[in-house]
């Protein structure tokens, strides 16, 4: 999956950021999990949407809104529930 961060500049502890995790052309619909740098699940303020394209493959976008600490790592894990395959990506904000 790919990750984007907004705002992506001039961030200070206390800022609320929006982290978007995107994965494209999967089948079937994926499961998305978020966790912090210590592996603790992040379940609040998460919005996940999935959309099928003409081929019946799914694009997934999951958005996490989080208040930054002094520094932090945020990871997104996209799981194929049938194949039990995981793909993950993370962003570290210092």
């Amino acid at each position: 999956p790919s990750m984007t961060l907004e705002p992506n500049k001039d961030l200070r502890p206390g800022d609320t950021v929006t982290i978007t995790c995107s994965s494209y052309q999967g089948y079937p619909e994926a499961e998305v999990f978020w966790q912090d740098g210590q592996g603790v699940p992040l379940t609040g303020n998460v919005t996940t949407s999935q959309m099928a394209n003409e081929q019946g493959l799914f694009d997934v976008h999951s958005i996490l809104r989080v208040v930054l600490g002094a520094n932090g790592t945020y990871s997104c894990l996209v799981r194929n529930p049938v194949l039990q395959q995981d793909a993950h990506s993370s962003v570290t904000i210092t």
């Epitope: 907004e6 705002p7 500049k9 001039d10 200070r12 502890p13 206390g14 800022d15 950021v17």
Partner: antibody, heavy 122, light 107 residues
Framework: QVQLVQSGAEVKKPGSSVKVSCKAS????????IYWVRQAPGQGLEWMGR????????YYAQKFQGRVTITADKSTSTAYMELSSLRSEDTAVYYC???????????????WGQGTTVTVSS | EIVMTQSPPTLSLSPGERVTLSCRAS??????VSWYQQKPGQAPRLLIY???NRYTGIPARFSGSGSGTDFTLTISSLQPEDFAVYYC?????????FGGGTKLEIK
Amino acid sequence: QVQLVQSGAEVKKPGSSVKVSCKASGYIFTADWIYWVRQAPGQGLEWMGRIYPGVDTTYYAQKFQGRVTITADKSTSTAYMELSSLRSEDTAVYYCARGGEVRRDFYALDYWGQGTTVTVSS
Amino acid sequence: EIVMTQSPPTLSLSPGERVTLSCRASENVGTYVSWYQQKPGQAPRLLIYGASNRYTGIPARFSGSGSGTDFTLTISSLQPEDFAVYYCGQRYSYPFTFGGGTKLEIK
């Protein structure tokens, strides 16, 4: 060129609200923070808060929490600062400023509006 | 909150003199300090960012230094247009704060 143009002077009664606008041009409005800073007569600069118009992320100084609201209209590239429950001590010049990336990973208030004088008087 | 203390509040000097303005932070702010110049009836103008970097178009007679808690702005040879109020400000942590300013006046 980058420009921040603010709305005109206001005279307000104690207890009322004021909304100051700041129209940006010459850069991508959604890609930089907008700050609000005020200056009481003969006094120094006081930071009030900031907004990132791209995703409407805001942060307010504790002193103004609950009384100030900073918003942005992406369609007109305009930021707003509304201050409520006005008192005489809020008489000041209110400035908006861009938090620009003046060099890679270096940020500062590089462009300022001309200031808006708000007078609170009964 | 981090308190930025500027000294002295006022300085009376003559054109051509060298001047050093001081700004002290109540706690470590790294190099997240900027300096601004303000003339009567005008908005502040950015001079120095990152404690020691001169902003575009600012004359070489202005220089900044420091890190941690102690910062200085030096004007090597005062010009008539330099008489103004100078503010330091930190954006290391919320709430961002400014010093009380140092007024440079002509002796």
